[in-house]
Amino acid sequence: QPSVSPGEPSPPSIHPAKSELIVRVGNEIRLLCIDPGFVKWTFEILDETNENKQNEWITEKAEATNTGKYTCTNKHGLSSSIYVFVRDPAKLFLVDRSLYGKEDNDTLVRCPLTDPEVTSYSLKGCQGKPLPKDLRFVPDPKAGITIKSVKRAYHRLCLHCSADQEGKSVLSDKFILKVRPAFKAVPVVSVSKASYLLREGEEFTVTCTIKDVSSSVYSTWKRENSQTKLQEKYNSWHHGDFNYERQATLTISSARVNDSGVFMCYANNTFGSANVTTTLEVVDKGFINIFPMINTTVFVNDGENVDLIVEYEAFPKPEHQQWIYMNRTFTDKWEDYPKSENESNIRYVSELHLTRLKGTEGGTYTFLVSNSDVNASIAFNVYVNTKPEILTYDRLVNGMLQCVAAGFPEPTIDWYFCPGTEQRCSASVLPVDVQTLNASGPPFGKLVVQSSIDSSAFKHNGTVECKAYNDVGKTSAYFNFAFKGNNKEQIHPHT
């Protein structure tokens, strides 16, 4: 019994003066609380509490359920206790079959004994199954058996409290352990699409998937920089124990331009938080933006190939595409494909393959594309570079020598005189007249240049060379002169 120094209030005394008492079932329990300032007796077992204001607690016919802790309290709040076991061969355990444990924490299997003198007080698996190898427990006859550091793997474990009574193993009612998981990671969140592009009035719907070990995970859709509560719908599934999935679907039935922005799906548990965002862009009407992948002015050499390539953004998706040249539509030689297979792709590529281009095939090539809202086009000006071709080279009646050449870019014509029979004509002759003949004609195709020199300047036999050249190449024509007396005679020109 407790003792304290004189002058200080002391705890009550209990008779019988023992910490534990064993009573046979059917016998009387008689407990006396000795204290001038007696207040009450309390009885506790398995979360059940009873009170008695008499200083003597009497139970005439004790039952197993009278097993428990009897506490006497005085007016100073000081108390003393005695634990009474009511031995009942037919009821060795008092049980509260609720059994919940938090992962990594201890939990109590509440099966206190009614007889402290039994042996082998322990846990057993149901139907003779062994307990998990790593399951550790600590028995306490007055409280039950504590399972140490509960594991997730113990969820729905069926077990009994067990004890040996007079050489026989006795089992309690069964317990089913329910384990509440510890959150050991942030929720896993994902979104159905990272971005959405819509026209005004269309429905916006986006789904966030949240995965965690328990349904006790918080999730919400938030509009960035806004406190407005968004309307969302949930679906959830348990794919197994500790494998929970929630789908939170956010819907705006008729999107407006000012609904554009970033939407965040946020989830958190006791470990931490995670989020994922999706971007909504609402446009008042569809659009097409075309981006040439090469310069829209194209120079290509005669006989070579060129690819005219455009990328374009189209929303809604493109319905008609075509390439046109000189009012003629190409039926082949071109391809059109999405830039990516992503379902939110709005970028496309179109390629026109021009092969072995002739000088006559320069001109404007136009790409046209349309969707349900708009049309758009882009033009490429294709110039075919051709080596000069000398169209005519003549001696005119007025004594002029004239050379006419065509090519692209515009040819330059130079004149040279070779005295005698020399083949190398180095002495240049200045032309009297140079004209570009078709400068005001069609913008594409070959340019024609005419150049003339005065042949009267030549006093000796020899050859005159007309050389037409541009970036692509050069071509020459020759005039041969022979003097007979004072007469100058032109021999037929040759190239």
Epitope: L46, S98, Y100, G101, K102, V217, H238, D241
Partner: antibody, heavy 119, light 106 residues
């Protein structure tokens, strides 16, 4: 043994709210799942939502989302269900039950609270 | 939501009869299926959890079977106290109950 003790019957006007309590006597209340299930006269059972007090977060059936609020007070081992914007079709017996979240079965039920909605 | 369809909705039987009630889920619910008994004016009582596990204190004449979408509750020999309404309930998605099967005295 653990019991779930519910508050008494209520008569409410349409448009008003009702708050029903459910006190658990004993056990590891904080780790229980406490759900609310209702039963209209002569009808079947309908889960409204539930909470695990330790985690503090309620889950609700889609039908009741935004109209029901389930809370729990660990210090008093009491769960609450508040239903707002009441209409006549909300007249039912409202049961609290242990279980209903994270695949828990309903292994313990309260006696039920009759809520009558009438003008 | 997962729909739970119970059949029959009612049946008449005599004491000692073997009674079978079926419950079909609109999609797979693995073994997350529970059976309850309810008597008039009383709260439901758990009979079977996880499709086939007998709840403590429930007589062994009650048994459950099935997995995936099809489940059965069997009462091997009907007793007078078994006349009641029986409900199945799934726990995979938002909880839903079957419509109930009323077992009446023939």
């Amino acid at each position: 043994q653990v019991q779930l003790v519910q508050s008494g019957a209520e008569v409410k006007k349409p448009g008003s709210s009702v708050k029903v309590s459910c006190k658990a006597s004993g056990g590891t209340f904080s780790l229980y799942a406490i759900s609310w299930v209702r039963q209209a006269p002569g009808q079947g059972l309908e889960w409204m939502g539930g909470i695990i007090p330790h985690f503090g977060l309620a889950n609700y059936a889609q039908k009741f989302q935004g109209r029901v609020t389930i809370t729990a007070d660990e210090s008093t081992s009491t769960a609450y269900m508040e239903l707002s914007s009441l209409r006549s079709e909300d007249t039912a017996v409202y049961y609290c039950a242990r279980g209903g979240l994270d695949t828990d079965e309903f292994d313990l039920w309260g006696r039920g609270t009759l809520v009558t909605v009438s003008s | 939501d997962i729909q739970m369809t119970q059949s029959p909705s009612s049946l008449s039987a005599s004491v000692g009869d073997r009674v079978t009630i079926t419950c079909r889920a609109s999609q797979s619910i693995n073994s997350y299926l529970n059976w309850y008994q309810q008597k008039p004016g009383k709260a439901p009582k758990l009979l079977i959890y996880a499709a086939s596990s007998l709840q403590s204190g429930v007589p062994s004449r009650f048994s459950g079977s099935g997995s995936g979408t099809d489940f059965t509750l069997t009462i091997s020999s009907l007793q007078p106290e078994d006349f009641a309404t029986y409900y199945c309930q799934q726990g995979v998605s938002d909880i839903t109950f079957g419509g109930g099967t009323k077992v009446e005295i023939k």
